[in-house]
Each structure stands twice: as C-alpha cells, then as structure tokens.
Interface confidence: low
C-alpha cells in the first residue's frame, strides 16, 4: 500500500478556494523528488496539473500552486476559484504520475445554494450551538415571534412566543425576547443534527407589516483532521468540545463499516480490549478538553476516529463531535523492538526502548500502565533516577546501547510485574512505545545467593553461578544506586580453553570485596551482556556487620541466607539436611567466603570468572 | 521520596500579593507535575494550579484565574505561587504537591508527595 496519505473526499462551493494536505514518510529521497497534483482521465492516466518543478497547467494558470514542506513531510495543493467543472477524481503523490506513489482524492465542487437577498448565512458544526438573530420593527414588539422551517414550498413552524415548540426540537430550542428598546429576538437551537441544515424565516408579526428574515443555516460534519503517524509510535488525539459539555461523559470512538462508531475508552471505564496496555484518556481540564494517547500503534489502527462527549459514553446524533483519520505509515522510522518479553519468577528482564535518535539528550522515562478507570502511567525510573522507592535495587535505566535505543533493567521478577509498561522521553511523543512482560514457568539461568552479610575489614567473596549458554557472553557485577548500577573492576576470565568443555554445573564469576567497608552494604547485580546489550541479571543485597567480640558465638563472617531444607552451622559451613553432598563442585557454587587474609591483587573490589574447580574454596 | 518545604506565606490586606515559595530535596523535580492546593478551615482541600514539568503547560481553579500564577525553576529545585489581588476567601493553608504520573492532568488524588503548608491569612 501506498505510503502517501491526504484527504479521501474534498467538497466546496463554486468560486470558493481549497486547500489539499498530502503527506509522505519524510525520508531524505522523499523530501526531494518531484510532488504532484494529477488529474485521472478515463484513459486512466493522470494529466499533471501542478507540481513541485513550478509546472501549472493552463487551466490552472494564476489559480493553483503547490508547495512542499520537506522537514514535516507534507505537501499542500491550493486551488482558488472552483468551477462544476474542478469536480472529478485526482491524485496527489511522489515522483512519476504512473509509479503509485501516491494518493487518491475525489473533489465535488457544488452549485452554491440560492438564497434570497439579504439571507444571514450560518455555518456551523453538529453538535453544536447556534444563535439566530431576527430583528424587528417597534411597532412588531408586542407581537408574536416566530421561527419557520422552509421545506419545499412549505413552512413549518419551529418555535414561537406562545410557547409552541416543534417536537423535532423538543428540549435543544429556545426563543429569548430581549427587554423593551433592544429591536431583536434571538433563537438558539443547541446539540445540532444534521437534519436541521436548511433555510429558517424569522417572523415578528403578521399581515402585511410583518417582519421577516431569512437565515440559511449549513450544519457541518467536522472535516476530519489527518493524522498520519508511523507503525508502532504513538499518536495523542486532543479533544476540546467546549465548556458547554465539560460535566458530560466523553469518548473517543472508532468508525467501523457499519458507519457506526465503536467505543475505544470512555470515561465511564469502557475500553476496547484491543487497545490494552496502549491506551490512556488523560483526565480532561477544567474547560472539558481532554486527550487520548494510544501507543504501539498498529496498521490495522488506521480508520476514522470520533470524540464527542454523551451521558451514555458514546455517540449520539446532535451532541459536539471532532473527527480525525488516521494513517499508519508501514515504512515506519521507528525500528521494531519486541512487543513482548517474558522472564521467570526470581528472574530479570532487559528491555529495549526506542528514542529518535536526533534527541539523545531528552530524558528517558519508564512508566507502568494501570487500566484502571481511564487508565494511566506512573513513572517507576528516569534517566536521572529511580522514581519509586518500591523499585528500590531491581530497576535501572542505562542509556545504552544509545543511538535511538535504551535499556530498561528489572530483576527479582514475581507475577505481579507481569503487565503493559511504556517507553517514554520528553522530546518527540510519536516515539512512546509499549512492551508487555509476562512472567512464564521457569528457573533464572544466573544463581547468587541469597542476602549475605559481610564483615568489616574482612573479605567477601560472592559467587554468581552462569549456564554454559552464557560463556560467550561478558560477564560483570555492579553495584545499584538509584542512579545506575556501576560496574566494578573485572579481572580477566582466563585462558579460553576453560570454555572449551564447559561444565554446566561449573561456570562461576565471583565478586570479591577485600577489605569489606561499611560503603560497601547494597544491592550487587551480576549480569551477562554482549557489547551494549544486556541479557540477564541476578541481584543480590550484602549488608555489613561489625565484627563480632571475643567469646561471643562465632559465626560464619560472611553469610548467605540459608535455602530453608539447609541450617547454618556454628562451624560456619551449611548442612543440607538428608542429602549427600556427592560433587564437592555443587557446594563450591553455593559458597560465600570469607577470608581475612591479604587478597593478592590488592585490589578493594574484584570480579573473577572461572570453574569452581580452579577456584577451589579460597578468595583470589 | 521527594520532600516539599512551602514558604512565603503570612498575614497581608485585602488587594495585597503575597509569593508562595516551594523547595523540594531528596530528588529533582524536573520530571514531576507540581501543583498548588489550599485548605480554609471546615472546608476540603481544593485544587488552586499545576504545572507541568517543563512548565509549558499551566491550569488554574476558576477563583483564581488572572490573579495567581504558578511558575517553577528546574534548576532551583524550586516551584512558585504568585499571589495578586487577594480576598479575604484566598485565607487557607496552601500546600505544595508532586506528582510523578505521566499523565496530562491531576486531580489530588494523584500527587503523591505533599508538603506540610504555609498559612495564608487575607484581612478585609
């Protein structure tokens, strides 16, 4: 399908001027080929009528021009004094009339009506308000007023000052007659229907001196706005019907084959189940306006989209309406990332969040979608920070690998952060996107230990067990702040001929702390990565203890929560109850040493890589 | 969690101006809606203004419009009320809020951090 997009039915009056928006993905080629405005025959051809190389055609010399707007991806046709004869079918488009590029346009072009002299035409939305003023001579004040419906030949009378209203107008109409000097009575019709677009005769009086005044009143269906947003970003509908509907329930609506409108959300708390996890109506201000942001957007998004504000939460002929069509842009800046992404329970996730890349100063957001009522979107994380303390040591926001893209961190996974979550910056809002995690059966592939505590100016060492699937990747361990998680100093892994026959109960990257400090207490995170892409993470929280005195009971100087099938000894080591330790290395793995003698290399903070073999039970 | 410190409140005449004034620590507020409420005594906290995060975007209750404004300086840390022409009905506790939702508008129900208050008194 094509990816330029305008308006699918243009309509005006002869002697009237349009205007025509087309729009293309804004790619360098795009924004400097040739633009068009063609004219189908019945050969199927399209005559070229205006284009962007400054050719106009005789017919529409000194009336039409065409220009383009490269930075937003738009062109506009403008077309001043039409004739019957503009009406037909035309194209807009990119680069050959023939290539199919392009997009096709119906232009109807109306005899204008004719009106009696001196009529007072009225031009107004459905759904809205309308004021007819109908002026009166002195001697007529007394009289009755009257409001006629011209229909054929007919008048049918609407309203009058003896309290007649048509039922037609039944509880939308109403007559004010201004107090003494003021030569005016004023009709104002509200909620308008289509069916009352027409001529209207104010009538003060009767017999010959009568006054009259015509009024043509042109009730419109709001021209739809185009939208045209890329495949999978996000698109904001603003929606402003006035205060006279500010306290009504609102909507936004889809229309479907039937010409008939499905409810997307309303603020009664219904919501189209296609749009979970993508959608929030954003509570409206105090003057009734409100917007509604839909993310992840899809092809099958397009169509046309109504708010309008009803009691009901859903549309109802007469009452304020605003129109947008939509077009989902499949040659989409916006790259693919997944929609989905699934972690165990104890397990982490790394998530992909695209930015344009033209603002890598913005700031990033993480938000949590809630359904709840219209739905919202707390922020959990930013670029500078955690935002909420419930998130405290399992979530981080690191701006790689950068150049359109970061990274979202959440570890100790449980079911409830299964749910919808959205990518957010303070620059362009088209690039908000979703990603849904779902928490599957499963056991995290990194092991660590449970919470271990260390002991001041004594050694820690804690091991973070890796499957065999990983030996490729680089292994690290940080340490969490609210602002990051800063990897500490790695030593080598060693020779690469210890991968070779990986043993997949033997691969361990340890993290040594010598001499343990009170800096130290925290959330540690161990994670594998390849370049600037994370994979998965474990977190771990040592905390610090004084060293014990003299004579009191000793224990283990370092310690890992014990499993509950295990009891920590006095000894310092763990007993699995009713089990038989057959492979020293399984041990190996669980172990948290502590050592108070020198570490070698000297340094305060180390990571090591190796088999549990070659690290044996001592600290390196 | 944020901390909000509000301040610049007092005694002044009916027509006077006063400038509330909001220092938020333990956080920046430059991704925060921040917004102004106030409490006359018997009566529920009403919402006074907000503003959004890069301050583009303001709103006022209809009894304040045209006579207060909200402004916030990210740097600072800080986030303002000017108060013009006051009545004695602008007597109340004015308090100073956050809010870390990602969403075009707030109703009190959705700051989350909330200062302790200052006390605004209009005389006739």
């Known amino acids: 399908k094509s990816p330029v997009f305008g308006p699918q039915e243009v309509s005006s009056v002869e002697g009237n001027s349009v205007s025509i928006k087309c729009y293309y993905p804004p790619t360098s080629v795009n924004r400097h080929t040739r633009k068009y405005w063609c004219r189908k025959g019945a050969s199927g051809r399209c005559i070229t009528l205006v284009s962007s190389e400054g050719y106009v055609s005789s017919n529409y010399a000194g009336r039409a021009n065409l220009t383009n707007f490269p930075e937003n991806g738009t062109f506009v046709v403008n077309i001043a004094q039409l004739s019957r004869d503009d009406s037909g079918h035309y194209k807009c488009g990119l680069g050959i009339n023939s290539r199919g590029l392009s997009f096709d346009v119906s232009l109807e072009v109306s005899q204008g009506p004719e009106l009696p002299n001196g009529t007072e035409v009225y031009t107004v939305d459905v759904g809205r308000t309308v004021t007819i003023k109908c002026p009166f001579k002195t001697e007529n004040a007394p009289k009755t007023k009257a409001l006629y419906k011209k229909i054929g030949q007919t008048s049918v009378l609407v309203i009058d000052s003896r309290n007649y209203v048509n039922p037609n107008y039944k509880d939308r109409i109403r007559l004010r007659i201004p107090g003494t000097g003021q030569l005016i009575f004023t009709v104002v019709i509200d909620r308008l229907r289509l069916s009352d677009h027409g001529l209207y005769l104010c009538q003060a009086g009767d017999g010959s001196n009568r006054d009259e005044k015509n009024a043509d009143l042109q009730v419109l269906e709001p021209e739809p706005e185009l939208v045209y947003e890329d495949l999978r970003g996000s698109v904001t509908f603003h929606c402003a019907l006035g205060l006279e509907v500010a306290n009504v329930a609102k909507f936004l609506c889809r229309v479907n084959s039937r010409e008939t409108c499905d409810v997307v959300i309303n603020t009664l708390g219904k919501r189209d189940s296609a749009f979970e996890g993508r959608i929030l109506l954003n509570p409206q201000d105090k003057d009734g306006s409100f917007s509604v942001v839909i993310t992840g957007l899809r092809k099958e998004d397009e169509g046309r989209y109504l708010c309008g504000a009803h009691s009901d939460g859903q549309l109802q002929e007469g009452w304020p309406i605003q129109a947008w069509q939509l077009f989902v842009n499949e040659e989409s800046t916006i790259p693919r990332s997944p929609t989905v992404v699934k972690g165990v329970a104890g397990g982490s996730v790394a998530v992909l969040c695209p930015y344009n890349p033209k603002e890598s100063q913005s700031l990033k957001y993480w938000c949590l979608w809630e359904g709840a009522q219209n739905g919202r979107c707390p922020l959990l994380v930013e670029s500078q920070g955690l935002v909420q303390e419930q998130y405290e040591g399992r979530l981080s926001l690191l701006q790689e690998p950068g150049n359109g893209t970061f990274t979202v961190i959440l570890n100790q996974l449980t079911t409830q952060d299964a749910g919808f979550y959205w990518c957010l910056t303070n620059g362009d809002t088209r690039w908000r996107t979703t990603v849904e995690i779902k928490i599957i059966e499963g056991e995290p592939n990194l092991k660590v230990p449970g919470n271990v505590t260390a002991v001041l100016g004594e050694t820690l060492n804690i091991p973070c067990h890796f499957p065999c699937k990983f030996s490729s990747y680089e292994k690290y361990w940080c340490k969490w702040s609210n602002t990051g998680c800063q990897t500490l100093p790695s030593q080598d892994e060693g020779p690469s001929e210890a991968f070779v026959n990986c043993d997949e109960n033997s691969r361990l990257v340890s993290l040594t702390l010598n001499p343990v400090t009170r800096a130290d207490e925290g959330w540690y995170w161990c994670g594998v990565k390849q370049g600037h892409f994370y994979g998965e993470t474990a977190a771990v929280y040592v905390a610090v203890e004084e060293k014990k005195v003299a004579g009191s009971r000793y224990v283990s100087p370092a310690k890992a929560d014990a499993a509950p099938d295990e009891k920590v000894l006095d000894s310092g080591v763990r007993e699995i109850e009713n089990k038989a330790i057959q492979d020293p290395r399984l041990f190996a793995e669980e172990k948290v040493v502590a050592d108070t003698g020198d570490q070698a290399g000297g340094s305060r903070a180390s990571v090591d890589s190796s088999s549990s073999e070659e690290q044996g039970g001592s600290s390196k | 969690e944020v901390q909000l410190v509000e301040s610049g409140g007092g005694l002044v005449q009916a027509g006077g101006s006063l400038r509330l004034s909001c220092a938020a620590s333990?956080?920046?507020?430059?991704?925060?809606?921040m917004g102004w409420f106030r409490q006359a005594p018997g009566k529920e906290r009403e919402f006074v203004a907000r503003?959004?995060?890069?301050?583009?975007?303001?709103d006022y209750a209809d009894s304040v419009k045209g006579r207060f404004t909200i402004s916030r300086d990210n740097a600072k840390n800080t986030v303002y009320l000017q108060m013009n022409s006051l009545k004695p009905e602008d007597t109340a506790v004015y308090y100073c809020?956050?809010?870390?939702?990602?969403?075009?508008?707030?109703?009190?129900?959705?700051?989350?951090?909330w200062g302790q208050g200052t006390q605004v008194t209009v005389s006739s």
């Open positions: 333990g956080r920046t507020i430059n991704t925060y809606v």
């Open positions: 809020a956050g809010s870390a939702y990602y969403s075009g508008y707030v109703t009190h129900r959705d700051f989350g951090s």
């Open positions: 503003i959004d995060w890069s301050g583009s975007s303001t």
